[in-house]
């Protein structure tokens, strides 16, 4: 009797199914959808969360499914297929042969086509902007104490490493927090800034994908800090090609 | 990238015997903890055997004395030898490049898969 036997969880995905029967009496922590055993240790790949996001139960999911055409708020909600490391394969293709390439957080960089689509290499998002608006408050936040807090919420809830967090802007009421993390600065074990993303944006929803922990409750100098609005803006190592019919639209 | 190719699988009677291959290629093959891991249809995947960089071996109960799992460092190759199978035994069979931590088993990457069926 183990103590992996006695707090077989998953601290750091609540999707997923855990048993103690893997190798030596250690628990196991199955993706749902995907059926990979994850680290727990760490934050799970956006794409095997997007995959056990997909395969809940429909009447599970809290969020209705927009449309092809959406333009803003589009969850960007889609089965991913996965590479065998968990991370999107850079070509993604729809139940009706419609194809599309992705890069590394999964949206689409390409207009969408046929099952003659080539996709070939997966392209690195290496710039994440997240623009935040805070409800009011009776004063601006200090903007020091803003940056700390921010960064401090990266390092320890997400396990990003400090260096990723580019920088972090503020003019009341709008928030941004600039990630930065080109292919070379990213080490064995480094949580990719795409996934770090991703908690941040269903922490933000009050949706998250920690396991029994409360949801987000983030304070500066004790003030609560509340967003109501959330844009997150993805800069690709290779810019995207879409056709000029769709710039122009 | 990691790459992992299954081969060997196919349809033997109970009672009969196949071996699976797994190609691996993409990381340093010697240095890493590698797995077996079937899914049966309409099941989850479940782990049956597990090997680590040194040579130790684990299995579950469930195939415990029929199923034997080795490598061959110098072809960056991992083989499952299936004795003895069961009806029950029929499942898509994947390998996996696999670690244990202080409490969990955790899997890295995985292969396609080959599927073995055991039918009379």
């Known amino acids: 009797h183990t103590a992996a036997q006695d707090n077989c969880t998953c601290p750091t995905n609540k999707m997923t199914v855990c048993s103690p029967d893997g190798p030596g009496g250690r628990c196991q922590c199955r993706a749902l959808g995907s059926g990979m055993a994850v680290d727990c240790s760490t934050l799970t790949s956006k794409c095997l969360l997007l995959k056990a996001r997909m395969s809940a139960p429909k009447n599970a999911r809290t969020l209705v499914r927009p449309s092809e055409h959406a333009l803003v708020d589009n969850d960007g909600l889609y089965d991913p297929d996965c590479d065998p490391e968990g991370r999107f394969k850079a070509r993604q293709c729809n139940q009706t042969s419609v194809c599309w390439c992705v890069n590394s957080v999964g949206v689409r960089r390409t207009d969408k086509g046929d099952l003659s689509l080539r996709c070939d290499e997966l392209v690195r998002t290496h710039h994440i902007l997240i623009d935040l608006r805070h409800r009011p408050t009776a004063g601006a936040f200090n903007h020091s104490d803003l940056d700390a807090e921010l960064r401090r919420l990266f390092r320890e809830r997400y396990r990003l490493h400090p260096k990723f967090v580019a920088a972090v802007h503020y003019e009341q009421p709008t928030i941004q927090i600039e990630l930065r993390q080109n292919t070379s600065q990213k080490a064995a074990g480094d949580v990719d800034i795409g996934d770090a993303a991703y908690y941040f944006e269903r922490d933000i929803k009050g949706e998250s994908l920690f396991q029994g922990r409360g949801g987000l409750d983030l304070r500066v100098r004790g003030e609560p800090l509340q967003v109501e609005r959330t844009l997150i803006y993805y800069l690709d190592e290779i810019p995207p090609k879409f056709s000029m019919k769709r710039l122009t639209a | 990238q990691v790459q992992l190719q299954e081969s060997g699988g196919g349809l033997v009677q109970p009672g009969g015997s196949l071996r699976l291959s797994c190609a691996a290629s993409?990381?340093?093959?010697?240095?890493?903890?590698m797995s077996w891991v079937r899914q049966a249809p309409g099941k989850g995947p479940e782990w049956v055997s597990y090997?680590?960089?040194?040579?130790?071996?684990y299995y579950p109960d469930t195939v415990k004395g029929r199923f034997t799992i080795s490598r061959d460092n110098a072809k960056n190759t991992l083989y499952l030898q299936m004795n003895s199978l069961k009806p029950d035994d029929t499942a898509l069979y994947r390998c996996?490049?696999?670690?244990?931590?202080?409490?969990?088993?955790?899997?890295?990457?995985w292969g396609q898969g080959t599927q073995v069926t055991v039918s009379s």
């Open positions: 090997i680590t960089s040194g040579g130790t071996t």
């Open positions: 993409g990381f340093t093959f010697s240095g890493s903890d």
């Open positions: 996996a490049k696999s670690r244990l931590t202080d409490s969990h088993y955790v899997e890295d990457a």
